[in-house]
Interface confidence: low
């Protein structure tokens, strides 16, 4: 029995005086607890308490189920125990069957034994199959057995407690352990759609997905900036042991412009949080936004094609659109496609294939379009250049020589004097009056120059040549002269060529 | 129609603080970027600062960074100008200007307040 | 920060055109806008990026630009075009903030 100083309260005194007591089932159990300040007896196994206020526990008729822990305790709280085991042949364990362990952690087989004396005391799997190779085990027989460190994978495993009597293997009820998953990441979060764009007055609803190992994840939505507590519904599912889904769905039956804004999805678990954001962006009007993928001024050589291109943003959906060209419509050479398949796409590609464009070709090329609100357009200024083309050369009444020339950009005309039949002319004359004429043709079409040098100041045969050019290329065009006597006799033009 | 009205500007002396508000309405607020200009008595425009569609982002003229926040309630269709250590050089007009296009920050002001007196005077 | 430089004063004839010119480094890259302000008023746009007019703005307003000079030319000046005209662009230096010009008085004779 403890010594105690006197003075300092000590703890009660039981008899018998040992830790561990061995009875057999059916005889007496009689404990006393000795102390001036006795209070109560208590005995604990399992789950179950029983208290006793007497300072004498009696139990005439011992059974098995009287195997546990008694205590004594004194009005200072300090308390002294016994342990009883109540060997009982046919019934060597006593068993609480509920068995949760959480992965990572130490669960308790409780399986108590009522003799302590017995062999062996084990684990063993249900209908012989072996036990988990890392499964480790620490048997206590006043508590049961200690499984360390559950794994995830030990999850509905079914076992016994096993021990040796006799030579014999006797084993407990089943256990069926189930695991409860440690949460080793975040929780998995997403978003029906990442972005929501609604008029006034339609129905906003989105939907957040949440995935972890089990239901005890924690998820709401937010709107960011705002402690408003938002209207959500749930819908859960168990896709097997450690795949848990939640879908939350918030609604927002007739969204205003002021709702406008960031919601988020937030969830967390003990290892941490995840969030996903959708924005939702409500305009009190549709609107429809063009932006030009080339610039809206554009030069094109005689004869090539050219794409004009437009990107847009439409909402709601287009529902019309259309190239004009000198107020005609194009029924084909143009395709008008969403730029991705996404659902919540608001923006458009439209392209107008222009092919082989000729110099008449030029002008304004629009391109509209509409929705149930709003109407937009895009006008495209297309410049064909040409290479200049020798319209007229002729000997005028007056002694001019005159050449007409048409091409886009705005051709340049030079003038040269070769001597006798040679077409290589290199000897430059002046013009004597230079006109830029007005084309009858469209806005864009070619320009048209007039050029005119005075013959009189050619006293030998030979030919003059007028070469028109700009950026795109060159032309030229040939006069021949003869002189008979002191007469020019004639002055006639070449066929027109490019040397 | 699109409005933009500041709230009274008002007198301030050196070093103290003043918040200037603008109303909108009349197109979706929260679409929009906002700017403040400022016009000092008898002289020429200067850009202040500029607040995104969102109110994430925000850029300042040199002349008030570190002493002038801009901030929006996209919720109430408000922008406001908060001005500390307020300087005599900051007397001026202050006019509200919504950016043309939707979602741009930097871009041409198409509607602008009607403009508020701010006087720092001691 | 780069400056948008503008004539302090310009004066037409009524009826007369008229260019008021804006000179900056960073309209080697962008557009100018312009801003119409009559006394006491806040400031108008009158013309945004290659040559736009906001809906209102008559069609005597028009713009242009060549090299680092933007132009706005009042075709036909009227009475009531009597006001200051501000150019606005973008900072060149790569902060994108706006940036206006002097101002540039117009009296319409």
């Known amino acids: 029995q403890p010594s105690v100083s006197p003075g300092e309260p000590s703890p009660p005194s039981i008899h018998p005086g040992k830790s561990d007591l061995i009875v057999r089932v059916g005889d007496e159990i009689r404990l006393l607890c000795t102390d001036p300040g006795f209070v109560k007896w208590t005995f604990e196994i399992l789950d179950e308490t029983n208290e006793n206020k007497q300072n004498e526990w009696i139990t005439e008729k011992a059974e098995a189920t009287n195997t546990g822990k008694y205590t004594c305790t004194n009005k200072h709280g300090l308390s002294n125990s016994i342990y009883v085991f109540v060997r009982d042949p046919a019934k060597l364990f006593l068993v609480d069957r509920s068995l949760y362990g959480k992965e990572d952690n130490d669960t308790l087989v409780r399986c108590p034994l009522t003799d302590p004396e017995v062999t062996n005391y084990s684990l063993k799997g249900c209908q012989g199959k072996p036990l988990p190779k890392d499964l480790r085990f620490i048997p206590d027989p006043k508590a049961g057995i200690m499984i360390k460190s559950v794994k995830r994978a030990y999850h509905r495993l079914c076992l016994h407690c096993s021990v040796d009597q006799e030579g014999k293997s006797v084993l407990s009820e089943k256990f069926i352990l189930k695991v409860r998953p440690a949460f080793k990441a975040v929780p998995v979060v997403s978003v029906s759609k990442a972005s929501y764009l609604l008029r006034e007055g339609e129905e906003f609803t989105v939907t957040c997905t949440i995935k972890d190992v089990s239901s005890s994840v924690y998820s709401t939505w937010k709107r960011e900036n705002s402690q408003t507590k938002l209207q959500e519904k749930y819908n859960s599912w168990h896709h097997g042991d450690f795949n848990y889904e939640r879908q939350a769905t918030l609604t927002i039956s007739s969204a205003r412009v002021n709702d406008s804004g960031v919601f988020m999805c937030y969830a967390n678990n003990t290892f941490g949080s995840a969030n996903v954001t959708t924005t939702l962006e409500v305009v009190d009007k549709g609107f429809i936004n063009i932006f030009p993928m080339i610039n809206t001024t554009v030069f094109v050589n005689d004869g090539e094609n050219v794409d004009l291109i437009v990107e847009y943003e439409a909402f709601p959906k287009p529902e019309h659109q259309q190239w004009i060209y000198m107020n005609r419509t194009f029924t084909d050479k143009w395709e008008d496609y969403p730029k991705s398949e996404n659902e919540s796409n608001i923006r458009y590609v439209s392209e107008l294939h222009l092919t082989r464009l000729k110099g008449t070709e030029g002008g304004t090329y629009t391109f509209l379009v509409s929705n149930s609100d709003v109407n937009a357009a895009i006008a495209f200024n297309v410049y064909v250049n040409t290479k200049p083309e020798i319209l007229t050369y002729d000997r005028l009444v007056n002694g001019m020589l005159q050449c007409v020339a048409a091409g886009f950009p705005e051709p340049t005309i030079d003038w040269y004097f070769c001597p006798g039949t040679e077409q290589r002319c290199s000897a430059s004359v002046l013009p004597v009056d230079v006109q830029t004429l007005n084309s009858s043709g469209p806005p864009f079409g070619k320009l048209v120059v007039q050029s005119s040098i005075d013959s009189s100041a050619f006293k030998h045969n030979g030919t003059v040549e007028c070469k028109a050019y700009n950026d795109v290329g060159k032309t030229s065009a040939y006069f021949n002269f003869a002189f008979k006597g002191n007469n020019k006799e004639q002055i006639h033009p070449h066929t027109l060529f490019t040397p | 129609q699109v409005q933009l009205v500041e709230s009274w500007g008002g007198v301030a002396q050196p070093g103290r603080s003043l918040r200037l508000s603008c109303a909108a309405s009349g197109f979706t607020f929260s679409s929009f970027a906002m700017h403040w200009v400022r016009q000092a008595p008898g002289k020429g425009l200067e850009w202040v600062a500029v607040t995104s569609y969102d109110g994430s982002n925000e850029y300042y003229a040199d002349s008030v960074k570190g002493r002038f926040t801009i901030s929006r309630d996209n919720s109430k269709n408000t922008l406001y100008l908060q001005m500390n250590s307020l300087r005599a050089e900051d007397t001026a007009v202050y006019y509200c200007?919504?950016?043309?296009?939707?979602?741009?920050?930097?871009?041409?002001?198409?509607?602008w307040g009607q403009g508020t007196l701010v006087t720092v005077s001691s | 920060s780069s400056e948008l430089t503008q004539d302090p004063a310009v004066s037409v004839a009524l009826g007369q055109t008229v260019r008021i010119t804006c000179q900056g480094d960073s309209l080697r890259s962008y557009y100018a806008s312009w801003y119409q302000q009559k006394p006491e008023q806040a400031p108008v746009l009158v013309i945004y990026?290659?040559?736009s007019r906001p809906s209102g703005i008559p069609d005597r307003f028009s713009g242009s630009s060549s090299g680092n000079t933007a132009s706005l030319t009042i075709t036909g000046a009227q009475a009531e075009d009597e006001a200051d005209y501000y150019c606005n662009s973008r900072d060149s230096s790569g902060t994108h903030l706006r940036v206006f010009g002097g101002g540039t008085k117009l009296t319409v004779l």
């Open positions: 990026g290659e040559n």
């Open positions: 200007a919504k950016a043309m296009v939707r979602g741009v920050t930097f871009g041409d002001l198409d509607y």
